[in-house]
């Protein structure tokens, strides 16, 4: 579609439209900023119940009924068309795609180091804390406890691989079963799909792009969760994972591989190592009970070192502990033996940041934790701000039919197997499913991708991230080999099953269902969000942690009555929807309950009463942001600033207040053209699809 | 070099004490066990315990357990051993003996103190 | 209490000779196992330790062997100044014990 406006598909029946429309759809603030999106234009809709405009000269096709919100939005082009530039506006859109492929890269690759980092910063605050987790005796009696510290742990670690290597050492050190070890696994899953839920937190700013992101995110969250649900009291009553795991460990005469390829790491490691270095046995030692290990600190200080065995003489409390009688003797008052010990001489230092500042690990933590959020934050913000400008019109097109479109019927079902295969793919060569659902996220976000085709992605990554397990376990040394392969292979094999639930039949595909509700309730009250996160990653696992370490009769005398409580409500929830009529009048809605219990609205405003005050202020500087990366950018003047703020005065207008007097052409397009602006084509212009 | 002193002789009565002293220089005090040795014409050399100047842990042989106590002086860099309720079979030259740091043999020794029991 | 046996006496040796002191420990002392020489009217000196470690200053002619229970201590060329008590002592466990002595003369 042309960027100026063009006769064509006049009205035919002006009288239909003109007065007597009297069932009106409600103007959403959503659809105006999914449909159609022209330079990022928007202006905040005025809220009164008006009729749709029609003109005699077309300018954007818009329905008049509301859009399904997850439909994908139209990526405007608003650029020129390729064939009306002369040379050198064919050339300087040439390097405009190059400058922002390279732009595009960079921040792509500063994206990643970030949550390499933010991962660093997470150990380094919660690091030891998440060690002493495991330190727990109880794990090996009570699943559900080893089901939260796998989230706990992944959460504070922000790193699965993390929380799966201190398993396998413990298994391999026999202070856990394997049996035991399953439930952590299944909680590490769990705790490794809050990143990408953070990474869509940081698209908060416009309501239909958050709406899609947090969906997208949260579709892994739901996706384990359910796995979790319905596998663990599978795994309780018949052991099928470790059963299995251990007939193809038996079952195969393994030999030491070689390490498994580091493939992104090896671009993203130069940068991050100088950044800050971690000492990752750090957290393992504690896991198994070391006591010295305590008083270690996870910054890595000595990167070259130079190890020595000698045979030392070394004092015992008693005869039992010498290495051999013939070993041992007495200096009149302690009984000494010869050992060996490996004497560890520091050669070099490491080259990071923090080496020589000699902070503690929550200082260095809290440091890191803010500076990679911003910076996470600020290259997804640039991300999607390309992404934006690149994906319009034909490229977009291209794009979203590649990657959304089906294969011709009788294959169509193939599609979502092979995006498995993908996401499996992709998660290999990046060895982080975090950073490959968390790229994905923004993607989500801005409607490149739909639900629909993420899901299998992230299922596919679910699997990817296992391979990489696997690959690592059969490089590990003979002593840990066996343990690490199988708790690799429980991890692999928990996955497939989770698959089988929850993809192959579309009915069953309960966490796309279940992360669009989320997704709708977020981007109402986007406040809810964080209360998820904060719920059901922290709240809950503590609170199961808590009652698990108070015993089984405690945690079965909360628990039961929670559970009876939730199938009830899901119970009620379903007649309710399916057939009302079964239940009395009282029952068909909720209204029986105090409107706090069964809506957002009353606690949506009072946390609107405590962060009002923060709102004016923030979008004050949202706003003063926003102008000057339009003027870096060299955005057309008319550029809406801020959508973060768009809701806020939304909400302002309705309360009566003025934000901006209404103007006499609210849409950019006309209002230039009224002005005598429109200008011809020019060379200089955004450069988008060809 | 290093060097322990110990009194020629000590003469006593049946049934009383007596503490013998063992001084020391050339080395620093706290770092080694201080070893006491009996020495009779019939037993040969016999083992009575040792002190660790450091922290003033001890350890005898059972045969003295009660009859000989081990102390030390820090500031002074001696050694003491008091044997007490002292019979004829006490008759003998006792020696103090500087143990060598990680193990039990002994690399100086005193001169030696000969205890007379006699009434 | 680990018995430390020391099977001659007194051990006759000219000039010039070579001698073999023996030793016998009880049970297994691995090779915390120490040699002194006493001279009349002296104290005991330190020859050798850990078995077969020479102290420092001693003269090459002295040197010992074995390990376990078996212990030999030799004088490859005596010297009329060597004429002494020569006692083993183990260090394997406590109580530390000695051997009862030999008395090396000259012929």
């Known amino acids: 579609m042309a960027p100026w406006p063009e006769l064509g598909d006049a009205q035919p029946n002006p009288s239909k439209y003109l007065e007597g429309a009297t069932s009106q759809q409600p103007i959403t603030p959503d659809k105006s900023k999914e449909t159609n999106k022209t330079d990022n234009t928007e202006v905040p809709v005025t809220k009164f119940e008006l009729l749709p405009t029609y003109s005699t000269a077309t300018l954007i096709e818009e329905p008049t009924e509301v859009d399904d919100p997850w439909n994908l939005p139209t990526l405007q082009d608003s650029g020129i068309k390729w064939s009306e530039r002369d040379a050198k506006g064919k050339i300087l859109c040439v390097f405009q795609g190059i400058g922002r492929l390279i732009l595009l890269l960079g921040f792509l690759y500063f994206f990643v180091c970030s949550l390499d980092v933010l991962s660093s910063a997470f150990q380094l605050v919660g690091g030891k804390m998440a060690g002493q987790f495991f330190s727990n005796s109880s794990i090996m009696s009570n699943p559900l406890l080893g089901l939260v510290i796998g989230v706990l742990v992944t959460v504070f670690v922000q790193s699965s691989s993390t929380s799966t290597s201190i398993v396998v050492s413990m298994v391999a050190s026999s202070l856990l079963t394997v049996r035991a070890a399953i439930p952590i696994i299944m909680g590490a899953n769990i705790g490794t799909s809050i990143t990408n839920t953070i990474v869509a937190l940081m698209q908060v700013g416009d309501r239909s792009e958050f709406r899609r992101a947090f969906a997208g995110a949260t579709v892994h969250d739901f996706f384990n969760w359910l796995s979790v649900l319905v596998l663990l009291p599978v795994e309780v009553a018949t052991h099928y994972l470790e059963v299995v795991t251990q007939l193809i460990v038996e079952s195969f005469h393994f030999k030491n591989g070689e390490d498994a390829p580091d493939l992104l790491k090896v671009i993203t490691k130069p940068f991050t190592k100088l950044i800050v270095q971690l000492d990752k046995k750090v957290i393992s030692q504690i896991a198994m009970n070391d006591e010295t290990a305590k008083n270690k600190s996870l910054v890595k200080i000595w990167c070259k070192t130079f190890t020595n065995m000698t045979q030392m003489n070394v004092t015992v409390p008693s005869m039992a502990n010498c290495t051999s009688p013939s070993l041992c003797w007495t200096d009149g008052i302690q009984i000494w033996t010869m050992k060996n010990v490996t004497y560890k001489e520091n050669i070099a230092k490491c080259q990071h940041i923090f080496v020589n500042f000699h902070l503690p690990d929550l200082a260095v933590g809290i440091i890191l934790l803010i500076i990679s959020l911003l910076v996470l934050c600020g290259c997804l913000i640039m991300i999607v701000k390309i992404l934006g400008s690149v994906l319009k019109g034909q490229v977009a097109t291209v794009i979203k039919k590649t990657i959304n479109t089906d294969f011709p019927f009788p294959f169509a079902w193939l599609t979502g197997y092979l995006a498995i295969l993908v996401g499996a793919g992709m998660t290999f060569i990046v060895q982080s499913s975090s950073v490959f659902t968390s790229a994905l996220t923004p993607l989500i976000g801005i409607g490149v991708i739909t639900i629909e085709r993420a899901y299998p992605l992230t299922l596919g990554s679910n699997i990817g991230t296992t391979t990489t397990a696997i690959l690592a376990a059969l490089a590990s040394p003979g002593n840990t080999l066996r343990s690490s392969l199988q708790i690799a292979l429980c991890h692999f094999f928990f996955n497939i099953s989770g698959i089988l639930l929850w993809y192959p039949i579309p009915f069953t595909r309960l966490p796309i269902r279940m992360a669009k509700g989320l997704g709708n309730i977020s981007a109402k009250y986007r406040w809810f969000a964080i209360f998820y996160l904060i719920i059901f990653f922290f709240l809950i696992p503590l609170t199961v942690f808590g009652l698990s370490l108070a015993g089984w009769p405690v945690l079965v005398g909360v628990g039961v009555p929670v559970v009876f409580i939730i199938i009830l409500v899901l119970c009620l929830r379903l007649l309710q929807s399916r057939c009302p009529r079964v239940l009395p009048k009282k029952l068909q809605n909720w209204n029986f309950l105090p409107l706090c219990m069964h809506s957002l609205k009353p606690w949506d405003a009072v946390i609107s009463k405590f962060t009002g005050p923060f709102q004016m202020p923030c979008c004050c500087c949202c706003r003063v942001c926003c102008r000057v990366c339009c003027l870096l950018c060299g955005c057309p003047k008319c550029c809406r600033c801020s959508k973060c703020c768009q809701d806020l005065e939304e909400g302002q207008e309705a309360q009566g207040v003025p934000v901006k007097a209404p103007e006499t052409f609210d849409n950019i397009t006309i209002s230039r053209e009224a002005q005598g602006e429109v200008r011809a084509p020019d060379s200089k212009t955004e450069c988008t699809a060809l | 070099q290093v060097q322990l002193q110990q009194p020629g002789a000590e003469l006593v009565k049946p049934g009383a004490s007596v503490k013998m002293s063992c001084k020391t220089s050339g080395y620093t005090f706290t770092t080694n066990n201080m070893h006491w040795v009996k020495q009779t014409p019939g037993q040969g050399l016999e083992w009575i315990g040792a002190i660790y100047p450091g922290n003033g842990a001890t350890a005898y042989n059972q045969k003295f357990k009660g009859k000989a106590t081990l102390t030390a002086d820090k500031s002074s860099s001696t050694a003491y051993m008091q044997l007490s309720s002292l019979t004829s079979e006490a008759s003998a030259v006792y020696y103090c003996?500087?143990?060598?740091?990680?193990?039990?043999?002994?690399?100086?020794w005193g001169q030696g103190t000969s205890v007379i029991v006699s009434s | 209490d680990i018995v430390m046996t020391q099977s001659h006496k007194f051990m006759s040796r000219s000039v010039g000779d070579r001698v073999r002191i023996t030793c016998k420990a009880s049970q297994d002392v691995g090779t915390a196992v120490a040699w002194y020489q006493q001279k009349p009217g002296q104290s005991p000196k330190l020859l050798i330790y850990w078995a077969t470690t020479r102290h420092s200053g001693v003269p090459d002619r002295f040197t010992g062997s074995g390990s376990g229970t078996d212990f030999i201590f030799t004088i490859s060329n005596v010297q009329s100044e060597d004429l002494a008590d020569y006692f083993c002592q183990q260090y394997s466990s406590n109580p530390l014990t000695f051997g009862a002595g030999t008395k090396l003369e000259l012929k």
């Open positions: 003996a500087r143990g060598m740091y990680g193990h039990g043999a002994m690399d100086y």
